[in-house]
Interface confidence: medium
Amino acid sequence: LSTCKTIDMELVKRKRIEAIRGQILSKLRLASPPSQGEVPPGPLPEAVLALYNSTRDRVAGESADPEPEPEADYYAKEVTRVLMVDRNNAIYEKTKDISHSIYMFFNTSDIREAVPEPPLLSRAELRLQRLKSSVEQHVELYQKYSNNSWRYLGNRLLTPTDTPEWLSFDVTAVVRQWLNQGDGIQGFRFSAHCSCDSKDNKLHVEINGISPKRRGDLGTIHDMNRPFLLLMATPLERAQHLHSSRHRRALDTNYCFSSTEKNCCVRQLYIDFRKDLGWKWIHEPKGYHANFCLGPCPYIWSLDTQYSKVLALYNQHNPGASASPCCVPQALEPLPIVYYVGRKPKVEQLSNMIVRSCKCS
Amino acid sequence: LSTCKTIDMELVKRKRIEAIRGQILSKLRLASPPSQGEVPPGPLPEAVLALYNSTRDRVAGESADPEPEPEADYYAKEVTRVLMVDRNNAIYEKTKDISHSIYMFFNTSDIREAVPEPPLLSRAELRLQRLKSSVEQHVELYQKYSNNSWRYLGNRLLTPTDTPEWLSFDVTAVVRQWLNQGDGIQGFRFSAHCSCDSKDNKLHVEINGISPKRRGDLGTIHDMNRPFLLLMATPLERAQHLHSSRHRRALDTNYCFSSTEKNCCVRQLYIDFRKDLGWKWIHEPKGYHANFCLGPCPYIWSLDTQYSKVLALYNQHNPGASASPCCVPQALEPLPIVYYVGRKPKVEQLSNMIVRSCKCS
């Protein structure tokens, strides 16, 4: 089912270089390299260099693409719910008369029952059901930090709604932190956003199973609609394998440039605009590490007889269960360039130019 | 350079189905389907169904992957800077004695100079240089909304720093909104976060070229370090082409399922667990739309003679300038399932199971 042939690395590089020639011109919508006849002599103006550096800084600070998923993310996540501590618990006593906030407490031993080890947690969401409301309000979520202090987590602008709706907040880091500590009662505060110059600090949003107004109806509230944590975690028995030798590597420059990996990997390729493309019209940079992806991604036939042997290979060679998996870029980064159009220098940013890692897809 | 052969669609589907069989078992770390001997009769427990539905809701609310980049994102972006209105301008007069905030005003005609049309704007960042500071402070950014009101945009937790550092806020939507309005002065407010119960509402962060304390030094402050907007936009002359007939389509289910596209596209494939895989052990759902990617991504030889004809094809067929572009999944979504292990029902989420769109990579 596989036809093997020797890869002519030089031809692949040549094709990649030629493709980049077309890509850059195409991104700039140029039919041919711009004429350099009117370019003023001397170095680039300081303001242009500053602008180029600003753009480069931005690129350095934030990769264009999200990080490749860690190996654990490939595997299934068990989903569980942990309901907040019942409102009749004495812990809510002190919070009763506070108009700007409502409070939700959780027992960390219930969380640990679902997620025995902090690293197994993949995602934790705080889910609140907001009752219908005719007002718009800006709300904030805080985490209980120590006895009398709260740490800000995030905010939301809630617009009027005719029907109850679920709100979801990503609290993965908070729950992981709780799991790293001893058991106890931990909590969240859901507050009105109090601006430095605002007068009305009252929380107008009502949350099912918690808003003071409705305390009398608590018995009738379906438990399912009380605030809860939705947890996604790798089951303990599945986690033991994650540290085995067969784990999936990130096919990034760190690994690929220092290994002799024959299968799909990122391969080193530096493009020198002058030497490789015969171009003098790009003034900055002089060249860049374009790199490229190369190597087989074997299709795995999962016929019953071979199951246990081949299943471990899926994660690396065919995680997307493709009919013909292919070695393609995963993380890409942009490239800022400086060039002239007539006498005018331009700073432009070209998206997805640098291949940082590859994957079988 | 291209060897064409007829695609056996049925074989591709069969291979995809078999790959999915292995993928699901592999994600669950199962060597074979679990025995159904102990599964209790009757429907799934209500709590399990509720949990499954909660997980399904999450998936509905947020796609696992970011949206495919719009066509305009493929093309180069011109980068420009717009400095804030000079602090000596009378507009700052009213803001002088406010301790919780500092203000930055911009002239929208300067912005329009750089970005003549709102849709051309690809990204706008507000850049502020924060001076060294020994305190931690939670800060917020607001947009001037009407004469005396401010709209919340975002926040940041600023930790102590020994050296000046640049802060960057994404204000693309705000600047696009300004461009849609008439010319005038618009602005931002950078404030201390005032919690409902906090006492200290003073802004302790100092911003280069703006903090009141340093007003005397303004003459000496290098203009480069004054707050500015960093704008990335498609140049006007390049934009004309974006609406031409040759533009890049999103290769998603909306387009691909309703067209006869021969090149790379997402193809429909529904997996019925019982019929296609012979599995009865997955209790919910009964099946799912797995879909798959198929179709050629021609490599384009960009030899000088053909430039103008082929450059427009890059965007669709080889945007990543690959030596051998390949049709692969772009947007993927997870799949929650319910199955039994012995007598115990489990809700698990499998990542990247549903192909929503494809791309040449």
């Epitope: 812990i91 407490f105 031993s109 640990r112 029952e113 025995p116 080890e117 902090p118 690293p119 197994l120 209980k144 120590s146 006895n147 009398n148 202090s149 799991l179 790293n180 500590q181 001893g182 058991d183 106890g184 009662i185 931990q186 909590g187 303990l236 986690a239 033991q240 | -």
Partner: antibody, heavy 120, light 112 residues
């Protein structure tokens, strides 16, 4: 009946090493976090280290960090404490203790202890 | 000095009620972490008496009870008996320390 039995204590010179073991029985060892707690002669209890149920997470007191390594073999229902670079202030009775639930930091079962003496 | 503060010694007569206190801070007892009480009889290993501040461990007589308010935890023994003579330790997770778990210095209870 839950049982924890420590062994491996003894007399050792400063800078030396010892490996303590704790054999567990009467409960599903792999489901619980376990800890080492020590008690110097005539003094109170001092928490030393903790290892989670699967052995993925380990935590140490500042006084032993970098010198002691805790590990477990769930197949053998055994807990270990590898002590290197021993100092005279490490002299104590070392107890292993089991968490009440998972990793609750509440010790519902203790071993009888093993004496470690660091002296020249 | 221990992060959890206990009186070093107390005494009481048989039949009396004694309360041993343990004072902490917002990063341990006041932070909502589970507090435990341990009894250590002379020459033996410690034994769990109270977990989660106010729950009796199995096999512990109901003469022993625990409570907590703010940064203060208490162990109360009613109807004191001779066999209650022992060292009593409180213990709690502490989020401000890299050490993680802390014990009080212990209270030596003498039954007169």
């Amino acid at each position: 009946e839950v049982q924890l039995v420590e062994s491996g204590g003894g007399l050792v010179q400063p800078g030396g090493s010892l490996r303590l073991s704790c054999a567990a029985s009467g409960f599903t060892f792999s489901n619980y976090g376990v800890h080492w707690v020590r008690q110097a002669p005539g003094k109170g209890l001092e928490w030393v280290s903790h290892i989670s149920a699967a052995g993925i997470s380990r935590y140490y007191a500042d006084a032993v960090k970098g010198r002691f390594t805790m590990s477990r073999d769930n197949g053998k229902n055994t807990l270990y404490l590898q002590m290197n670079g021993l100092k005279s202030e490490d002299t104590a009775v070392y107890y292993c203790a089991k968490d009440r639930i998972r990793s609750s930091y509440e010790y519902d079962s203790w071993g009888q202890g093993t004496q470690v003496t660091v002296s020249s | 000095l221990p992060v959890l503060t206990q009186l070093s010694s107390m005494s009481g007569s048989p039949g009396q009620t004694v309360t041993i206190t343990c004072t902490g801070s917002s990063s341990n007892i006041g932070g909502g972490y589970y507090l435990s009480w341990y009894q250590q009889l002379p020459g033996t290993a410690p034994k769990l008496l109270i977990y989660n501040a106010n729950n009796r461990a199995s096999g512990v007589p109901n003469r022993f009870s625990g409570s907590k308010s703010g940064n203060l935890a208490s162990l109360t023994i009613t109807g004191l008996q001779a066999e209650d003579e022992a060292d009593y330790y409180c213990g709690c997770y502490d989020s401000s320390l890299s050490t993680g778990y802390v014990f009080g210095g212990g209270t030596k209870l003498t039954v007169l």
